[in-house]
Interface confidence: medium
């Protein structure tokens, strides 16, 4: 025997108390699948969150963060304060990266400079709070008789990642 509620489309709920008729979702709620017995309440993008997509009767609202903050967690469940490049966010706010570390983004933590010597290379460009060191060719490559020197690949521009 077919469940009469299976005929209730997205955007409605099947009302047990009214002979299982399909009732539209109440205001500020949605059902993204058919046959539901209740509608989910819409997410509200309040405070530091702002609405990226409005709630409809069949889909939830989507939030992102106001300028100066960035999303964290699945579905932008949290907004975290941005810092400047060369800084990291601590419990006490944005702090400059310690010597020997860098951060080339407005989010995340300061990471240690690359240790060029571990790869048998030399430091071509010193690191800063905002940039990692650039490793050059190994000292052996620079010795007389070495065939050719391949120039180092340019450092990736900060703030850009594959879309």
């Amino acid at each position: 025997l077919q469940d009469p509620c299976s005929n209730c489309p997205a955007g409605t709920f099947c009302d047990n108390n009214r002979n299982q008729i399909c009732s539209p979702c109440p205001p500020n709620s949605f059902s993204s699948a058919g046959g539901q017995r209740t509608c989910d309440i819409c997410r509200q993008c309040k405070g530091v969150f702002r609405t990226r997509k409005e709630c409809s009767s069949t889909s939830n609202a989507e939030c992102d963060c106001t300028p100066g903050f960035h999303c964290l967690g699945a579905g932008c469940s949290m907004c975290e304060q941005d810092c400047k490049q060369g800084q990291e966010l601590t419990k006490k706010g944005c702090k400059d990266c310690c010597f020997g570390t860098f951060n080339d983004q407005k989010r995340g933590i300061c990471r240690p400079w690359t240790n060029c010597s571990l790869d048998g290379k030399s430091v071509l460009v010193n690191g800063t709070k905002e940039r990692d060191v650039v490793c050059g060719p190994s000292p052996a490559d620079l010795s007389p008789g070495a065939s050719s020197v391949t120039p180092p690949a340019p450092a990736r521009e900060p703030g850009h990642s594959p879309q």
Partner: antibody, heavy 117, light 107 residues
Framework: QVQLKESGPGLVAPSQSLSITCTVS????????ISWVRQPPGKGLEWLGV???????NYNSALKSRLSISKDNSKSQVFLKMNSLQTDDTARYYC???????????WGAGTTVTVSS | DIQMTQTTSSLSASLGDRVTISCSAS??????LNWYQQKPDGTVKLLIY???SLHSGVPSRFSGSGSGTDYSLTISNLEPEDIATYYC?????????FGGGTKLEIK
Amino acid sequence: QVQLKESGPGLVAPSQSLSITCTVSGFSLTSYAISWVRQPPGKGLEWLGVIWPGGGTNYNSALKSRLSISKDNSKSQVFLKMNSLQTDDTARYYCARGTGTWYFDVWGAGTTVTVSS
Amino acid sequence: DIQMTQTTSSLSASLGDRVTISCSASQGISNYLNWYQQKPDGTVKLLIYYTSSLHSGVPSRFSGSGSGTDYSLTISNLEPEDIATYYCQQYSDLPWTFGGGTKLEIK
């Protein structure tokens, strides 16, 4: 037959965390919301939070930082976790099915949790 | 948060009486109000949803009314099994909140 049954530890030491399971039968968690409600001895009902058919949650603002509600649809179980318990968290904890325009049409019998050292 | 107030915490009535239990909200809740009955053993049942809709299986002697901030539950012909505590609950806005309850006793 629609049923909800809470199972909890009974006794919890202060500052410890509480985990309660609500096992449901006769319906699917993908179609109904489940709310948690508690009642301290001799006091009224207090709504703790809800988990929606799609898995989203909402919480009582006073307890939000200590509460977490999750579920396993395939096992027909909903879980309440509360951290940093104090003696005033001693209560009977109920799970209830939310349907229609968000009324609780079926309730579990409740499980009593005592916070004491 | 919306505060729900049941001013009468306990009420004594005789069998056959018509009993009214009131509930008020700290702001308008647009009829988004439910009523629950809790028996002395702790069992909780839904009586009325959306102010005045009778839940299936609930005797017709129970009825609900109200609008704006003021709501009431009426039991038209009190029976022994109605001895219980009655709670109103709003779902106009999250977090959902209950009234403090009204305990009904027999004279």
